[in-house]
């Protein structure tokens, strides 16, 4: 059962796992949600009736029954983790806490003009978890405007105290706002021999990397595969750090793999969701329950639905035994990872999918489909929408992409002459325009947000957001596409597709079926040569074949240039402009979305 409200002047008795310090009860709830075992918490607010050393304590709790006895206590605020809820969860915390000093290791001190600048510095520093900034009014002259960057082993403060004229806050890395590089490569036959901050068991290097990503102190990792010569170290995942933030020591060693935390790209790849099955693999841990199940998929569902289950092992049924049902062992551990991993015993193991909701919805894999030709199939591009105008008559105006449950990203030039959002309709989950009838459901548009530097498509800033009047319920046929991570600026995309209902040639009509074309990206230098009369800026991206023949065209505007990278689709471009359509040596020009991520997040995350 999902309980989101906080219980004032209430304390949960017993079940303590650990105590951390948080600046608010709301953030305590987030910490509890992300902790592998926490189901409930009690937070102590500042209060004259409470011992100041207990202010801001956040006690994380667990219970076999998923609840604990309640006791009345002034200044105590209690609640439940969001693990029990089905809604999307985020660790992003933009709050600034006034007159609070969050204690940690002060590893960097510098002058900053504002708290915002201090927070940005923290966000772009690999080690920083949170900061404290002494304002202009701070009593001590030499400490005024000082920005202290801090880190701790847990990522949360070691203590929080009241201190006049300072403000504190957290790094915004988990809000996708970091400019740090996103290094996705996994290096085979490599050991990083720097300091270990922790070690866990993992079935493969990808899970090890994802564990590193959501571990507060891990910057890179080394994983020993199941072929590693030393049996006691097989499947061992070493979580590592270094002062410089990079490995100082790389040693060639067979059957080991190493890689980096994906903290700076976590919004465009799954980091909590370990969805694979591991065959002939047994996960050991504390047993929660043993239930009969028809398949390993059914076992995973049972684990996902049991709030305390973290991972499972399924042993298939022996022939004609127990109505063909195997045994499903639901398990847990103190850190959410198996305590040991064994191979060759016939089990099939995996993890709960309950944590998938902590990842961005856009990272979910699309069910593979057999596709060919230029017409799309249903559900192939579930982020693609058709934007209609109803004035003077209803017609397709532009394409667009779902990027959030209330947000469509499209091109600014689509709204030339559009006086009001009232005349707009957004249709999602559509394959054929002919599906749209009088009674077809649509999303009304509450607000059109055009980039304030937009003048015309050819001069750039051709980007706009539509805020929908109601939220989109994600399904297989309508869900978001990931924005590229700012740390991904150097990624070379090789699998890019432009989609839309636009013209098939310059003098044509809107197509009934959503069309798709695979188009290679072109460097900006190359693109500039093809458009001597225009300035191709770094905020634009070009795509097209030298010989022409495939391109976006009239009516595709605002739609996505979607590129697949590491099994996840990213919205790399927005169809903007070009000279004619599919002409030889005239690539299509698209708005370069990665350059607008800050703008998008600023507009969509505004309180």
């Amino acid at each position: 059962e999902c309980v989101t409200q906080l219980l004032k002047d209430t304390c949960f008795e017993g079940g303590d796992i650990t105590t951390v310090f948080t600046p608010s009860a709301k953030y305590c709830q987030v910490v509890c949600t992300y902790h592998p075992r926490c189901l409930l918490f009690t937070f102590t607010a500042e209060s004259p009736s409470e011992d100041p050393t207990r202010w801001f304590t956040c006690v994380l709790k667990d219970s076999v029954t998923e609840t604990l006895p309640r006791v009345n206590r002034t200044a105590a605020i209690s609640g439940y983790s969001f693990k029990q809820c089905s809604h999307q969860i985020s660790a992003c915390n933009k709050d600034i806490y006034v007159d609070l000093d969050m204690k940690g290791i002060n590893y960097n001190s510098s002058v900053a003009k504002s708290a915002q600048e201090c927070q940005e510095r923290c966000t772009d520093d690999v080690h920083c978890h949170f900061f404290t900034y002494a304002t202009r009014q701070f009593p001590s002259l030499e400490h005024r405007n000082i920005c202290l960057l801090k880190h701790t082993q847990t990522g949360t403060p070691t203590r929080i105290t009241k201190l006049d004229k300072v403000v504190s806050g957290f790094s915004l890395k988990s809000c996708a706002l970091s400019n740090l590089a996103c290094i996705r490569d996994i290096f085979p036959n490599t050991v990083f021999a720097d300091s270990n901050i922790d070690s866990v068991m993992a079935p493969d290097a990808f899970v090890c990397g994802r564990i590193c990503t959501h571990h507060p102190g891990c910057l890179f990792f080394t994983f020993f595969s199941q072929e590693w010569p030393k049996e006691s170290q097989r499947n061992l995942c070493l979580l590592k750090t270094s002062e410089s933030g990079l490995p100082s020591t790389r040693i060639k060693k067979s059957k080991a793999l190493s890689g980096f935390s994906l903290q700076s790209c976590r919004h465009s790849i799954p980091v909590f969701c370990h969805s694979s099955f591991y065959h002939d693999t047994d996960f050991l841990g504390e047993e929660l329950d043993i239930v009969a199940a028809k398949s390993h998929e059914a076992c995973q569902k049972l684990c996902t639905n049991a709030v305390r289950c973290q991972f499972f092992t399924y042993t298939p049924a022996q022939a004609s035994c127990n109505e063909g049902k195997g045994k499903c062992y639901l398990k847990l551990s103190s850190n959410g990872s198996p305590t040991k991993i064994l191979h060759g015993r016939g089990g099939i193991s995996g993890y709960t999918l309950r944590l998938c909701k902590m990842d961005n919805e856009c990272t979910t894999k699309i069910k593979p489909r057999i596709v060919g030709g230029t017409a799309s199939v249903r559900g192939e591009w579930p982020w693609q929408v058709t934007l209609h105008t109803t004035s003077p008559t209803q017609r397709h105006l532009c394409g667009g992409s779902i990027i959030g449950n209330q947000w469509i990203l499209t091109a600014a030039h689509c709204f030339y002459g559009v006086e009001s959002p009232k005349i707009l309709r957004v249709y999602s989950g559509i394959l054929n325009q002919s599906e749209i009838k009088e009674d077809t459901s649509f999303f009304g548009v509450q607000e059109i947000i055009i980039h304030d530097q937009y003048k015309m498509a050819e001069s750039g800033y051709d980007i706009a957001l539509l805020k929908l009047e109601t939220t989109v319920n994600y399904t297989d046929s309508q869900r978001p596409i990931c924005l590229p991570s700012k740390g991904d600026r150097n990624v070379i995309y090789t699998d890019c597709w432009v989609t839309g209902w636009g013209y098939r040639k310059l003098r044509d009509k809107i197509q009934n079926t959503l069309q798709k074309a695979k188009i290679p990206l072109v460097t900006n230098e190359e693109c500039q040569k093809r458009y001597r009369g225009h300035k191709i800026t770094h905020k634009m991206i070009c795509a097209g074949y030298r010989e022409g023949g495939k391109d976006a065209c009239k009516g595709d505007s605002g739609g996505p240039l979607s590129c697949k990278h590491n099994e996840v689709w990213h919205l790399v471009g927005i169809t903007s402009w070009g000279e004619g359509c599919a002409q030889r040596e005239r690539p299509g020009v698209y708005t370069n979305v990665v350059e607008y991520v800050d703008w998008i997040l600023e507009k969509t995350q505004a309180v």
């Epitope: 021999a193 300091s195 270990n196 049996e231 006691s232 170290q233 061992l236 070493l238």
Partner: nanobody, 126 residues
């Protein structure tokens, strides 16, 4: 009980040499990757050199060309020949087996299957 026992440390003048030894027992030495780490007072644990089971070697930049790691599998012994010693080489030197990195920057704690010796002090001073 796995044991790693270091010897050969002591006081030496700058420019001098020392040879450290590490005698290993109770585990398959020839299948293990061996390493020398060091920790100076108030500093993090630092990897000095490794030698893998198949003979591959690695040296930290600060010791390259001055230190040589070797092993004698028949004697279950690891060596570190240290030449042209400098004051900044002063530290406690630890022998380690299958220990890829130290925990919390401290040369004493192991994860599964990794082992440390108790350390030998090397002091370089005139």
């Amino acid at each position: 009980q796995v044991q790693l026992v270091e010897s050969g440390g002591g006081l030496v003048q700058p420019g001098g040499s020392l040879r450290l030894s590490c005698a290993a027992s109770e585990f398959t030495f020839d299948d293990s990757d061996m390493a020398w780490y060091r920790q100076a007072p108030g500093n993090e644990c630092e990897l000095v050199s490794t030698i893998t089971s198949d003979g591959g070697t690695y040296y930290a930049d600060s010791v390259k060309g001055r230190f040589t790691i070797s092993r004698d599998n028949s004697k279950n012994t690891l060596y570190l020949q240290m030449n042209s010693l400098r004051a900044e080489d002063t530290a406690v030197y630890y022998c380690a087996a299958d220990q890829w990195g130290s925990a919390e920057g401290d040369c004493t704690s192991s994860y599964p299957g990794g082992y440390w010796g108790q350390g030998t002090l090397v002091t370089v001073s005139s």
